[in-house]
């Protein structure tokens, strides 16, 4: 029975995620009842990704490990539209780690998922990045420029944003 085997496959896939994500919120993709895309509850979704705002204050490395445990990474921002979506869920008086760092202090910025760093798709505040010792990137709000990126010390605890691919079942 086709529907039965599809259900069994879904259940086994859900079991994979159950350890870290006991609850998923799923929506039907398109018109085909067979295809569902899910994000862990209470993550938010945008296009093909899920996002989680971590309000615990942790260093950049610990923040990345924390995302990793949940099957995610610190957020990699690929477009202005994606950033515009993300900032809807952020608090103006807080700063949030991005998945962007320069561990060598040579201004060779790198994304955690190995996405090539494209200078043309960056949203640094004016005058940033400005310190070779500040090797990790945050997104924060400045009244003059709204939301943008800033380089800060990696060991300084901040909030963070995790991102993972949607779960398709």
């Amino acid at each position: 029975n086709f529907m039965y085997s599809k259900t069994v496959k879904r259940l086994s896939k859900l079991r994979e995620y159950q350890q870290y994500h006991p609850s998923l919120t799923c929506v039907m993709e398109g018109k085909d009842i067979e295809d569902w895309s899910c994000c862990p509850t209470p993550w938010t979704s945008f296009q093909s990704s899920c996002y989680f705002i971590s309000t615990g204050m942790q260093s950049w490395t610990k923040s990345q490990k924390n995302c990793s445990v949940m099957g995610a990474d610190l957020v990699v921002i690929n477009t202005r539209e994606e950033q515009d979506f993300i900032i809807q869920n952020l608090k103006r008086n807080s700063s949030y780690f991005l998945g962007l760092s320069d561990p060598g202090g040579r201004r060779h910025w790198q994304w955690v998922d190995q996405t090539p760093y494209n200078e043309n798709v960056t949203f640094w505040h004016s005058g940033e990045p400005n310190n070779l010792d500040e090797r990790c990137a945050i997104i924060n709000f400045r009244s003059s420029e709204e939301w943008g990126w800033n380089d800060i010390h990696c060991h300084v605890p901040q909030k963070s944003i995790c991102k993972m691919k949607k779960i398709y079942i």
């Epitope: 942790q58 260093s59 950049w60 490395t61 610990k62 990345q64 490990k65 760092s101 561990p103 060598g104 202090g105 400005n130 310190n131 070779l132 010792d133 500040e134 090797r135 990790c136 800060i152 010390h153 990696c154 060991h155 300084v156 605890p157």
Partner: antibody, heavy 121, light 111 residues
């Protein structure tokens, strides 16, 4: 040659204040984060405060937060520690240390000789 | 805060022998192959002096008889062979996150 020279220590009564200074030479002071680390008599090392190179970031442990203030004057190549509401447990040798960043963290590559603070009635 | 526990608290070693000091962190201080644990030597009446940074890198001017190893939560400082001038206290320090913390120290005496 890198040199860090602390001054300003002394004997002070509980509740009193002191201002420690650290004069830096032999390197571009404004390019480095700096810290104060203390050592109580016969005890180990305890980090007291940090200030970033650009003065944008200061950090303290709970034991001194609200009582101690770290600051710097890059034009004078000087680091300071203003210590208020001093307690007996603040008695220690206070070292000024330069931070050198490595990957996602840092270490203290140069230390001053230290200045002694004694809090006693 | 990350707690660093050094052992032993003290040890006496004969010249020419090996001295081994361990430092255990309450959580990992490593990230993607970088180990943010450092070692300092402090002789009586002197300030601390950097020996090893990032677990295994020998600071310039430090004799090659000092070496460091380890990853994640367990790190080791080895002095081999020990010389009389190595009488000192030795401290580990982590910097992967604030606040930076030090181990309680190990006193090395030469027999």
């Amino acid at each position: 040659e890198v040199q860090l020279v602390e001054s300003g220590g002394g004997l002070v009564k509980p509740g009193g204040s002191l201002r420690l200074s650290c004069a830096a030479s032999g390197f571009t002071f404004s390019s480095y984060g700096m810290s104060w680390v203390r050592q109580a008599p016969g005890k180990g090392l305890e980090w007291v405060s940090t200030i970033s190179s650009g003065d944008s970031y200061t950090y303290y442990p709970d034991s001194v937060k609200g009582r101690f203030t770290i600051s710097r004057d890059n034009a004078k190549n000087s680091l300071y520690l203003q210590m208020n509401s001093l307690r007996a447990e603040d008695t220690a040798v206070y070292y000024c240390a330069r931070q050198l960043y490595y990957s996602y963290g840092y270490y203290f590559d140069y230390w001053g000789q230290g200045t002694t603070v004694t809090v006693s009635s | 805060d990350i707690v660093l526990t050094q052992s032993p608290a003290s040890l006496a070693v004969s010249p020419g022998q090996r001295a081994t000091i361990t430092c255990r962190a309450s959580e990992s201080v490593s990230f993607h192959g970088t180990h943010l644990m450092h070692w300092y030597q402090q002789k009586p009446g002197q300030p601390p002096k950097l020996l090893i940074y990032a677990a295994s890198n020998l600071e310039s001017g430090v004799p090659a008889r000092f070496s460091g190893s380890g990853s994640e939560t367990d790190f080791t400082l080895t002095i081999n062979p020990v010389e009389a001038e190595d009488t000192a206290n030795y401290y580990c320090q982590q910097s992967i996150e604030d606040p930076p913390t030090f181990g309680g120290g190990t006193k090395v005496e030469i027999k």
